[in-house]
Amino acid sequence: KKVVLGKKGDTVELTCTASQKKSIQFHWKNSNQIKILGNQGSFLTKGPSKLNDRADSRRSLWDQGNFPLIIKNLKIEDSDTYICEVEDQKEEVQLLVFGLTANSDTHLLQGQSLTLTLESPPGSSPSVQCRSPRGKNIQGGKTLSVSQLELQDSGTWTCTVLQNQKKVEFKIDIVVLAFQKASSIVYKKEGEQVEFSFPLAFTVEKLTGSGELWWQAERASSSKSWITFDLKNKEVSVKRVTQDPKLQMGKKLPLHLTLPQALPQYAGSGNLTLALEAKTGKLHQEVNLVVMRATQLQKNLTCEVWGPTSPKLMLSLKLENKEAKVSKREKAVWVLNPEAGMWQCLLSDSGQVLLESNIKVLPTWSTPVQP
C-alpha cells in the first residue's frame, strides 16, 4: 500500500493509473467504500463522502489513463485509505495528514516559551525535528517546547515530520517581540540635549499598546515615572509626563524621547516598558544616562561623572596634547593649581573615549572659560 503524507490546509494529489492510455470508467472510494468521485463518460461525478466539496480530479489527464484524486484544504480527519477502482483493479493509497501549529500565537514576547504541537491521525507514530533560525535543533513527539525565546529565534522555523520513512516539511514564521537592544547607555556633557531611542526588533501591520519610562536617578532614593504613553497603530500619544524633567516624545516609531538637557540630578538608569495589546507580559529596555561636568573653582580643576559607570572605566584630566595629569577608576578626579591651557576631561573604556569635556584654564589673573 502506497503511503502519502499531507499537510493540513494544503492540497494533495493521489495518483491512479490505468494500463490503457485512454479515458475509461474509474471510481475513488474511501475506506468505508463510499464513493468520493468518479466519471460518467466525460463528466465528473461526486458521491456523498465528506470530501465532496473538496475533492476533484484532472479531466485533462483522463485520456492518458491517469485518474488523480485531488483533495483541497486537507484536514487531519481526511487521513484514510483511499481506493481507486479502474480496469477491475484496486489501487490503495494511505493518506496521513499532519498539522503543526504554534501555541496560541506566532508573535511571542522575548523570554516567553514557544510550544509547537503536532496534530496527527490516530494510529500514526511520527517523529518531529525542528530547526530554529539560529540553527538550534530540537526533537520531540506530539509537542516541542522552547523556553526563554531570544531575539535570534525570530524567523522561519523548519520542522520535519517523519512517518513510514516519508517526510513532510512545515515552515512556521515566529516573531519574537523585543526591543533591538536589551540595554543602552548614553554619555552626555552637562547641559547637552539627550536623545533616547527604543527601536523595536520587529515590524507588524498594526501596533497598539501602552508604555511607561520609570527612572531611578543616582541621587534619588526611589524611582519615578517620567512619562506614560499610548501606542495606537504605530502612532504615539503622551498620556502623562513629569514637570521635571519635561521629556518630549516623538509621535512615530521608533519610540524616541528627548531630555532637554543633561543634568547631574538626572543621571541614572531607566526602564522603558511596553505592554502590547492582546499580549501577556511586557517588553523591556533598560537605558542609562551618564553625565559629565568639568569645573574650575579657585585653584581646583575638577571632573565628575554621575550615573551607572562600570568600575573599569577610566576618568582622566589632561592638558591638551600632553600626558594625563590624573587618571583614576573613580567618578571624580581633580588637579590642584592647573597650568593655563585647554584641559580635557575624558571618560574612557580600554583606551576608547566615551565622553569628553573641555575646559579652558586661563592664567591665574583671569576667570575660566568653558567652551
Epitope: 468505508n32 463510499i34 460518467q40 461526486k46 458521491g47 456523498p48 465528506k50 465532496n52 466539496d53 480527519e77
Partner: antibody, heavy 120, light 107 residues
C-alpha cells in the same frame, strides 16, 4: 439515542423566506451530515441539501439559488432558509441525519416532519 | 441528476403474500442504493442499505438485491404492519435522489 425536532412557522406568504430549525438532542451535532428533505402532499421525497459543521453545505441544484443552510453548534441546531417561496414549496419538511460507516450511507434518524403551507 | 424510477407505483396484496418492487437508475450506481418505508403521517425509516444489507432491527422478511442500474426489494411474507409506501434512494452521486415511491395496499 439521537432525536430530531423540526420547528418553524407553518404558514409562509408567497415571495417570503421559509425558515426552519432542527434541534438535535441526545447526541452531538459535530461529525455528521444533517440534511433537509421535503415531501409535498401525496408525492415523493425530495432531498434539499445537507450541512456538516466542518464542511461546506451541499445543495440540490434545483433549489440551490434559493437555499441557505447553517449550523449552530452551541445550540445543537441546524437550520434551513428557502427564499422566494411559491405554492410549489408547500410540503412536509423533514430534517434527518446522514450517517456514513463501512458500506453504509443512509438517513438513519429523522425528525417527525413539519408542515409548511405557502399561502397569502 | 440521477433519475430513480420505481415499478409499480402502487400495488395491492394480502397478508402472507410475497411482494417485489423494482427500482431502476438512469445510470450505473454500483450498489449505492437504500430502501425506505414510510407510513402515513410518519417519517421514512431505513430498511435496506448498500442495495442488500438489512438495517439492524429490521425483520428478515425484507430483502434487497441488484447492482448497476437494476434493483429489487422483496417482502417474503407480508405482515399487516408492512402496508406503507416504499422508496428507493441512490447515494452514488449528489444530489441524492429518491424514486417516486410504491404504495403497498391491503387487497
Amino acid at each position: 439515542q439521537v432525536q430530531l425536532q423540526e420547528s418553524g412557522p407553518g404558514l409562509v406568504k408567497p415571495s417570503e423566506t421559509l425558515s426552519l430549525t432542527c434541534t438535535v438532542s441526545g447526541g452531538s451535532i459535530s461529525r455528521y451530515y444533517w440534511s433537509w428533505i421535503r415531501q409535498p402532499a401525496g408525492k415523493g421525497l425530495e432531498w434539499i441539501g445537507r450541512i456538516c459543521t466542518s464542511e461546506n453545505p451541499n445543495y440540490n441544484p434545483a433549489l440551490k439559488s434559493r437555499v441557505t443552510m447553517s449550523v449552530d453548534t452551541s445550540k445543537n441546531q441546524f437550520s434551513l432558509k428557502l427564499s422566494s417561496v411559491t405554492a410549489a414549496d408547500t410540503a412536509v419538511y423533514y430534517c434527518a441525519r446522514e450517517l456514513e460507516r463501512l458500506n453504509y450511507y443512509g438517513m438513519d434518524v429523522w425528525g417527525q416532519g413539519t408542515t409548511v403551507t405557502v399561502s397569502s | 441528476d440521477i433519475q430513480m424510477t420505481q415499478f409499480p407505483s402502487s400495488l395491492s396484496a394480502s397478508v402472507g403474500d410475497r411482494v417485489t418492487i423494482t427500482c431502476q437508475a438512469s445510470q450505473d450506481i454500483s450498489n449505492y442504493l437504500n430502501w425506505y418505508q414510510q407510513k402515513p403521517g410518519k417519517a421514512p425509516k431505513l430498511l435496506i442499505y448498500d442495495a442488500s444489507n438489512l438495517e439492524s432491527g429490521v425483520p428478515s422478511r425484507f430483502s434487497g438485491r441488484g447492482s448497476g442500474t437494476d434493483f429489487t426489494f422483496t417482502i417474503s411474507s407480508l405482515q399487516p404492519e408492512d402496508f406503507a409506501t416504499f422508496y428507493c434512494q441512490q447515494y452514488d452521486t449528489l444530489p441524492i435522489t429518491f424514486g417516486q415511491g410504491t404504495r403497498l395496499e391491503i387487497k
